[in-house]
């Protein structure tokens, strides 16, 4: 971890499960103490920190567990707990008689589980690289990509589905490979669609407004997490995009504009873009919208292209002490591919993490094409 | 920096031809589309013809369709409006224009978007008179 | 074919006003709609595109809004070298036919 990369206020020890936050005043860690809102506080902490959810939480006991490290306990303010998507809004530094405080283990992301070390001008990648891609089917052909969220959650672009392509038995997601003709990758069913609300060109087929391109897509049944198949990480909550921060977008579409889709899966490292510059005149000139970004180098040669939308442009960090991957942004949009100061365009996907958490919460029964604002 | 440059007006008879240039640079040519806009003396603008020169699709104004042939040589960045049975309502500045596309990048083929004319040339002037 | 009606067809005004042009479209062209100010003898220049995005390195004293199918320029302090002609224009995405105004020509009062 560099020194420019601070830790995370919330924690997880990976020794025995106890969440553990800042104290920015006093400069310490402190423990969660117990209350009867463990479940909530234990959701809200593993959101905070990037992850999807608390698989379980318990109590620990400082007497017998110790301290490790942190001095003191914070407390939640329960009344204020069900109206706020921030932990760090709702605590404060406490006595905590009891000595018990909270535990969590968080479903794990962003890590590949093997010792492993187009996209246009990318490269092929290796199996178990990038396990959380998959490939949006529709009809057997590959449309769109897509970020396994969990083993049943899958985040895409939302323009991924015209009305055109609403027949949600026809779709099938495609992981655990890195070549599309592999025997070796799962296959599995659709069982809903999610897409924002605020979408427009679903609204108005010609609206030139295409900001809220993200959608989820619910599976049918469970992926197996194993070796090729793993989640991706989520931003932690009020964790920015670093200018000029390189990353990596990853697909199976085209290598060239309006060329062949690749038949493994293409890897390239992109540089995040300002806003600033990517809306100047000579780029975009003020099409970037404030839930967008742009990715890419001014002189063109590496990008995303044509059936890439909806998969991951991934950062790695080390703000979770464990160097993880996290979701940063969705292959959307761009003029051509690869071309200078035309560089590809992502849905910020740290602007939807509550719509995210919101649909996941909501339509885990759902059916068929719905819609969240 | 972007440069769009007109040539080929001039004088010519009613019934008469005239082949119009646009020298683009400064841009990506493939992925613009280019236009071609007049103006008759004191009136507005008028569009006239539109091409998108990737797909090579090309569009046109009722008043010029079956009389001017829109086109665009990619490896001169160049565009260019043949104007053929020409009348004396077509005299005009006309001018060159470009607009930015951008499509999405899913695996079936996208509508290409275009959005307003950002780069326009000097004009060129087409007088038609006996 | 969609007609763009622009009003005024000429309006007089001082330094400082505030203007405001209108147009409106014969049928929905959703937000595809740019504004264009040009002055005698030379070429348009974009202000104004999808309707209210204003177009890099123009003053911000220039905005556009949408409400249904109908679009507004408005200059909010108007300045000397802003006495010029305007002219909206749809580019409707679905035929990529291009309709402009008749345009609105503002003169000094």
């Known amino acids: 971890r560099s020194d420019q990369e601070p830790l995370y206020p919330v924690q997880v020890s990976s020794a025995d499960a106890r969440l553990m936050v800042f104290d920015k005043t006093e400069g310490t860690w402190r423990l969660l103490c117990s209350s009867r809102s463990n479940a909530r506080v234990a959701g809200l902490s593993c959101e905070e920190m990037g992850f999807l959810r608390a698989l379980t939480h318990s109590e620990l006991d400082v007497r017998t567990a110790g301290a490790n490290g942190t001095s003191g306990f914070f407390c939640v303010d329960e009344g204020r707990l069900p109206h706020t998507q921030r932990l760090l809004e709702v605590i404060s530094v406490c006595d905590c008689p009891r000595g018990r405080f909270l535990a969590a283990i968080c479903q794990d992301c962003g890590r590949r589980k093997l010792p492993v070390d187009r996209i246009v001008g990318g490269r092929d990648t290796s199996l178990g690289r990038w396990p959380w891609q998959v490939s949006l089917r529709y009809d057997g052909a590959h449309l769109c990509g897509g970020s396994l969220l969990s083993g049943d959650w899958v985040l895409t672009a939302a323009h991924c589905f015209p009305e055109r392509n609403r027949v949600l038995s026809r779709w099938r997601v495609f992981a655990g490979a890195v070549a599309q003709a592999s025997p070796h990758g799962l296959q599995l069913g659709v069982q809903a669609v999610v897409y924002h609300g605020g979408y427009l060109p679903f609204r108005d087929p010609n609206s030139e407004e295409n900001s809220n391109d993200i959608a989820l897509v619910h599976l049918s049944s469970p992926l197996p997490l194993t070796e090729y198949i793993q989640p991706v990480c989520l931003p932690a909550a009020g964790q920015a995009l670093v200018d000029g921060k390189i990353c990596t977008v990853t697909g199976w579409g085209n290598t060239q504009y309006y060329g062949q889709q690749a038949g493994v899966l293409q890897e390239a490292r992109v540089p995040i873009i300002s806003n600033d510059v990517c809306n100047g005149a000579d780029f975009y000139g003020n099409q970037i919208k404030p839930k967008m970004f742009c990715a890419g180098y001014p002189e063109g040669g590496i990008d995303a292209c044509q059936g890439d939308s909806g998969g991951p442009f991934v950062c790695e960090d080390s703000i979770s002490r464990t160097p993880r991957w996290r979701l940063c942004g969705i292959v959307s949009w761009g003029t051509g591919c690869a071309l200078a100061q035309k560089p590809g365009v992502y849905t910020k996907v740290s602007d939807f993490r509550e719509w995210i958490f919101q649909a996941i919460k909501t339509h885990s029964e759902a059916s068929g094409m719905v819609t969240q604002l | 920096e972007v440069q769009l440059v007109e040539s080929g007006g001039g004088l010519v008879q009613p019934g008469g031809s005239l082949r119009l240039s646009c020298a683009a640079s400064?841009?990506?040519?493939?992925?613009?589309?280019m236009h071609w806009v007049r103006q008759a003396p004191g009136k507005g603008l008028e569009w006239v013809a539109s091409?998108?020169?990737?797909?090579?699709?090309?569009y046109y104004a009722d008043s010029v369709k079956g009389r001017f042939t829109i086109s665009a040589d990619t490896s001169k960045n160049t565009a260019y409006l043949q104007m053929n049975s020409l009348r004396a309502e077509d005299t005009a500045v006309y001018y060159c224009?470009?607009?930015?596309?951008?499509?999405?990048?899913?695996?079936?083929?996208?509508?290409?978007?275009?959005?307003?004319?950002?780069?326009w040339g000097q004009g060129t002037l087409v007088t038609v008179s006996s | 074919d969609i007609q763009m009606t622009q009003s005024p067809s000429s309006l007089s005004a001082s330094v400082g006003d505030r203007v405001t042009i209108t147009c409106r479209a014969s049928?929905?062209?959703?937000?595809?709609v740019a504004w264009y100010q040009q002055k005698p003898g030379k070429a348009p220049k974009l202000l104004i595109y999808?309707?209210?995005s204003l177009y890099s390195g123009v003053p911000s004293r220039f905005s556009g809004s949408r409400s249904g199918t109908d679009f507004t320029l408005t200059i909010s302090s108007l300045q000397p070298e802003d006495f010029a002609t305007y002219y909206c224009?749809?580019?409707?995405?679905?035929?990529?036919?291009?309709?402009f105004g008749q345009g609105t020509k503002v003169e000094i009062k």
């Open positions: 091409i998108y020169s990737y797909y090579g699709s090309t």
């Open positions: 400064g841009f990506n040519f493939s992925y613009s589309y």
């Open positions: 224009q749809q580019y409707y995405s679905s035929y990529y036919l291009l309709t």
């Open positions: 049928q929905s062209v959703s937000s595809a």
């Open positions: 224009a470009r607009s930015d596309s951008w499509s999405y990048k899913s695996g079936y083929t996208q509508k290409i978007y275009s959005k307003g004319l950002d780069y």
């Open positions: 999808s309707a209210s």
